[in-house]
Interface confidence: low
């Protein structure tokens, strides 16, 4: 069971990143699915290595004082959402903006029906060029 | 099937990074090989988690305006090269240069004879000290 | 065999990061253990994908000139410690400090009784908020 999906620009104002089965994507079988373009949902309980990479372009003066944060989150059936992993990068002083990349990855136990998704502080700063931003998992 | 190879400084002007089976490297068997010191080639079709880490040292004033970009690329038999993953980091203002590290990783389907390699915008900026820059894969 | 442990602030002055089995941690079985809160020790020989993520907050003026470096290290029975992976990030000019995240990961052969741990140049700069700093491995 494995998946690798590709970022997609979205007009939605939500902080949850959108993904698509496009380009050189992976969706090994129907035991993992991309739901609503925003979350990877697994049907089998087990240990999964889950990862995300987010490239963004921001400028210190044009952004809030808070850093750019990417969060890998989990929603299990009947449970509240929880943060699994986070990474933070202070905005660049480069103009008009400076690109930076964040990589998250870790091993987690997922229940049947559990979904994982990626949240960012400012989706408008995310880079969607080929290969820059992606999200995936693999069952151990 | 798994491999982990170590960066090697090169006098070549190519943007493709060079690697060696040295130090604490891994080459599990002959189903994955390091070819010409530049690409990992697999003999078996399947899903692979492929990763690369690149540490570099650059300075904004001494570099081009474009960010430092590391790309994980795929060459399949009879197909054109394609980018699987990219990461970008704006150059540091630190002098003489500021070190930064990039990590790339994702799950991809590889065909028999497929090769993966790593491209960077400026190989002269890459750090080759122990552990700083490496490249590998594992078959799921 | 898999583990994922969560960073823990420590009053110790050691450069070795401390970890705990808390929050959304993973410890698949007793073939991998967290020893002294600082190292993951495996009982079985084999290939492991080992990873660490470190988020830190530093300021160029308040820090040494040297970059922030995170090292993934190995101690095998009858061998000296050695560095497997390192990543470096130059300190931010943001005030009071600028957050940055480092991700390390690679495939390595471990012997029975081998331990892996994470070293940083300045543990006081490490961020211990939910999900920011973690460490784990999985057996291939």
């Amino acid at each position: 069971i494995a998946a690798h999906v590709i970022s997609e620009a979205s007009s939605k104002t939500t902080s949850v990143l959108q993904w698509a089965e496009k380009g050189y994507y992976t969706m090994s079988n129907n035991l993992v699915t991309l739901e609503n373009g925003k979350q990877l949902t697994v049907k089998r309980q087990g240990l999964y290595y889950i990862y995300a990479q987010v490239t963004f372009c921001s400028n210190r003066e044009a952004s809030s004082q808070a850093p750019f944060i990417a969060s890998l989150c989990l929603k299990s059936p009947g449970r509240f959402e929880r943060i699994l992993l986070r990474a933070a990068n202070t905005h660049s002083s480069a103009k008009p903006c400076g690109q930076q990349s964040i990589h998250l990855g870790g091993v987690f136990e997922l229940q049947p029906g559990a979904s994982v998704f990626v949240n960012v502080t400012d989706p408008s700063q995310v880079s969607h060029g080929t290969g820059f931003t992606s999200f995936g998992l693999l069952k151990l | 099937i798994a491999a982990h190879v170590i960066s090697e400084a090169s006098s070549k002007t190519t943007s493709v990074l060079q690697w060696a089976e040295k130090g604490y490297y891994t080459m599990s068997n002959n189903l994955v090989t390091l070819e010409n010191g530049k690409q990992l080639t697999v003999k078996r079709q399947g899903l692979y988690y492929i990763y690369a880490q690149v540490t570099f040292c650059s300075n904004r004033e001494a570099s081009s305006q474009a960010p430092f970009i590391a790309s994980l690329c795929l060459k399949s038999p009879g197909r054109f090269e394609r980018i699987l993953l990219r990461a970008a980091n704006t150059h540091s203002s630190a002098k003489p240069c500021g070190q930064q590290s990039i990590h790339l990783g994702g799950v991809f389907e590889l065909q028999p004879g497929a090769s993966v390699f790593v491209n960077v915008t400026d190989p002269s900026q890459v750090s080759h000290g122990t552990g700083f820059t490496s490249f590998g894969l594992l078959k799921l | 065999i898999a583990a994922h442990v969560i960073s823990e602030a420590s009053s110790k002055t050691t450069s070795v990061l401390q970890w705990a089995e808390k929050g959304y941690y993973t410890m698949s079985n007793n073939l991998v253990t967290l020893e002294n809160g600082k190292q993951l020790t495996v009982k079985r020989q084999g290939l492991y994908y080992i990873y660490a993520q470190v988020t830190f907050c530093s300021n160029r003026e308040a820090s040494s000139q040297a970059p922030f470096i995170a090292s993934l290290c190995l101690k095998s029975p009858g061998r000296f410690e050695r560095i497997l992976l390192r990543a470096a990030n130059t300190h931010s000019s943001a005030k009071p400090c600028g957050q940055q995240s480092i991700h390390l990961g690679g495939v390595f052969e471990l012997q029975p009784g081998a331990s892996v741990f994470v070293n940083v140049t300045d543990p006081s700069q490490v961020s211990h908020g939910t999900g920011f700093t973690s460490f784990g491995l999985l057996k291939l």
């Epitope: - | 060696a20 089976e21 040295k22 130090g23 604490y24 490297y25 891994t26 000290g129 122990t130 | 095998s76 009858g78 061998r79 050695r82 560095i83 052969e109 012997q111």
Partner: nanobody
Framework: EVQLLESGGGLVQPGGSLRLSCAAS????????MGWVRQAPGKGLEWVSV????????YYADSVKGRFTISRDNSKNTLYLQMNSLRAEDTAVYYC????????????WGQGTLVTVSS
């Protein structure tokens, strides 16, 4: 064929110094971590020091820390061990060692050079 040839051993008084050398051939020296191991009379092998491929990293046993210095000259394919403030307990046969390709264990050893510390 891999060859490791140690030299520089001998008899020295406590507090004295010696410099051991190890000439390597038959492999790409600069691609390997190298180490020194010793065996005292009637005892097992003890790791003394290890140096990384380019010499930027060095590790020492607690028993020799601050007294011994490992170094290498990749242009000469030679490994060194500078031993200062020698003690009687440093008496041993010192071996130069090259790691196995997987870097998990050391698979090649020299014939050793005897260091005797005695007044």
């Amino acid at each position: 064929e891999v060859q490791l040839l140690e030299s520089g051993g001998g008899l020295v008084q406590p507090g004295g110094s010696l410099r051991l050398s190890c000439a390597a051939s038959g492999f790409t020296f600069s691609n390997y971590e190298m180490g020194w191991v010793r065996q005292a009379p009637g005892k097992g092998l003890e790791w003394v020091s290890v140096i990384s491929e380019v010499g930027s990293l060095t590790y020492y046993a607690d028993s020799v820390k601050g007294r011994f210095t490992i170094s290498r000259d990749n242009s000469k394919n030679t490994l060194y061990l500078q031993m200062n403030s020698l003690r009687a307990e440093d008496t041993a046969v010192y071996y130069c060692a090259k790691p196995h390709d997987s870097s998990i264990g050391f698979d090649y050893w020299g014939q050793g050079t005897l260091v005797t510390v005695s007044s």
